[in-house]
Amino acid sequence: QNASRGRRQRRMHPNVSQGCQGGCATCSDYNGCLSCKPRLFFVLERIGMKQIGVCLSSCPSGYYGTRYPDINKCTKCKVDCDTCFNKNFCTKCKSGFYLHLGKCLDSCPEGLEANNHTMECVSIVHCEASEWSPWSPCMKKGKTCGFKRGTETRVRDILQHPSAKGNLCPPTSETRTCIVQRKKCSKGERGKKGRERKRKKLNKEERKETSSSSDSKGLESSIETPDQQENKERQQQQKRRARDKQQKSVSVSTVH
């Protein structure tokens, strides 16, 4: 395939030479290239009052190549087009025009939007989100124990971000209140407050030992027994029951 491309041989004239420069197959002293070597394009360049033939490996910007049996020519792209494969297939439009299916348009057709970065008409892309994850364990202050009412969360990913005219992304995180069967925290699970209570209890006992006259009623009353906590929660729960017939869902929007 890389053999010569079957060009018809021109009849030699007295001023036609075959010892040509720069890709010419035949040339003359006055007109430059008259024909080109295979895979080269013949272009006429105006120099002052005369036109000189030159052979180029590719057509200049704004031109496209057409093959003929005896010559490859460069032809101008359409007026609104900067780069093209042919007059009907533009690949880059001039400033102020948008490329769509090889054509240059001053505005994009219905259902498409202009991308001002690529200067193309592109499909409107709507946001796509994944399915929700399962609800997280019911938690309060980072713990899954030592309480009755907490919150649980579920999340989803954005699979496709929207284009300028596309539908916005929905929330990617959702939180709701939840109720669990109350369970005591094991030693390892105790949070900061549990440790503080323990420390206060120890201090109280130390004070008892060192100064029997020190009154520790105030301190003692600040520590509720599990039964007291349970009763208090039961009362609060009755008050809230009317409100809490349906679990409320609170959407935390972290739209991308």
């Epitope: 496209y64 057409t66 093959r67 490859n72 032809t75 494969f85 042919n86 690949t91 299916l101």
Partner: antibody, heavy 117, light 111 residues
Framework: QVQLVQSGAEVKKPGASVKVSCKAS????????IHWVRQAPGQGLEWIGY????????GYNQKFKNRVTMTRDTSTSTAYMELSRLRSEDTAVYYC??????????WGQGTTLTVSS | DIVLTQSPASLAVSLGQRATITCKAS??????????MNWYQQKPGQPPKLLIY???NLESGIPARFSGSGSGTDFTLTINPVEAEDVATYYC?????????FGAGTKLELK
């Protein structure tokens, strides 16, 4: 002489991406656009898109627009075609070809892509 | 998109006989007097090979028994006389508009 040598066969899982290379020699790499065409088993030819090696500008068939990316490395005269979010229907032989004055005159030997779970 | 319809889908011809394959475009592939129609030959396990460009021009190195004709929407590839090495699938392809498209192919076999 002009030669286009493509990378070897690939086996991918659905949802994955593949990047096929096409190394050009025997001509000035930046002179002609490189196009990619695919052929599913026992099927016809389907144009995917093109890249101008001179400036990296590319254009794609609308069918592949959101999944394909074409790049090039002028220092090694190599063109690349990356296809993402693969599905079983993408199983095909992928060809690169030089585009000279509105026809594909030189072709790579083809790269077989199999997409299977 | 320009749809190219090739006929017949397959063709059995005796050695030395003429084979004719047609390609019909859903719209004209002509512009400024040029026809943007090409023909390719593909043998099993090989890439396509350019035979005819711009409807009727023979690619260099291709035997003269291959010829192309037509304009607008109707194009023909003729092989005369058919030789054993011509057993292959033949595709038409238009370069006039984005996206570039190919016909579905015509499989040539020997009778």
């Amino acid at each position: 002489q002009v030669q286009l040598v493509q990378s070897g066969a690939e086996v991918k899982k659905p949802g994955a991406s593949v990047k096929v290379s096409c190394k050009a020699s025997g001509y000035t790499f930046t002179d002609y656009s490189i196009h990619w065409v695919r052929q599913a088993p026992g099927q016809g030819l389907e144009w995917i898109g093109y890249i101008y090696p001179s400036n990296g500008d590319s254009g794609y068939n609308q069918k592949f627009k959101n999944r394909v990316t074409m790049t090039r490395d002028t220092s090694t005269s190599t063109a690349y075609m990356e296809l993402s979010r693969l599905r079983s229907e993408d199983t095909a032989v992928y060809y690169c070809a030089t585009y000279f004055a509105n026809n594909f005159d030189y072709w790579g030997q083809g790269t077989t892509l199999t997409v299977s779970s | 998109d320009i749809v190219l319809t090739q006929s017949p889908a397959s063709l059995a011809v005796s050695l030395g006989q003429r084979a004719t394959i047609t390609c019909k475009a859903s719209q004209s592939v002509d512009y400024d007097g040029d026809s943007y129609m090409n023909w390719y030959q593909q043998k099993p396990g090989q890439p396509p090979k350019l035979l005819i460009y711009a409807a009727s021009n023979l690619e260099s190195g291709i035997p003269a028994r291959f010829s192309g004709s037509g304009s607008g929407t109707d194009f023909t590839l003729t092989i005369n006389p058919v030789e054993a090495e011509d057993v292959a699938t033949y595709y038409c392809q238009q370069s006039n508009e984005d996206p570039l498209t190919f016909g579905a192919g015509t499989k040539l076999e020997l009778k």
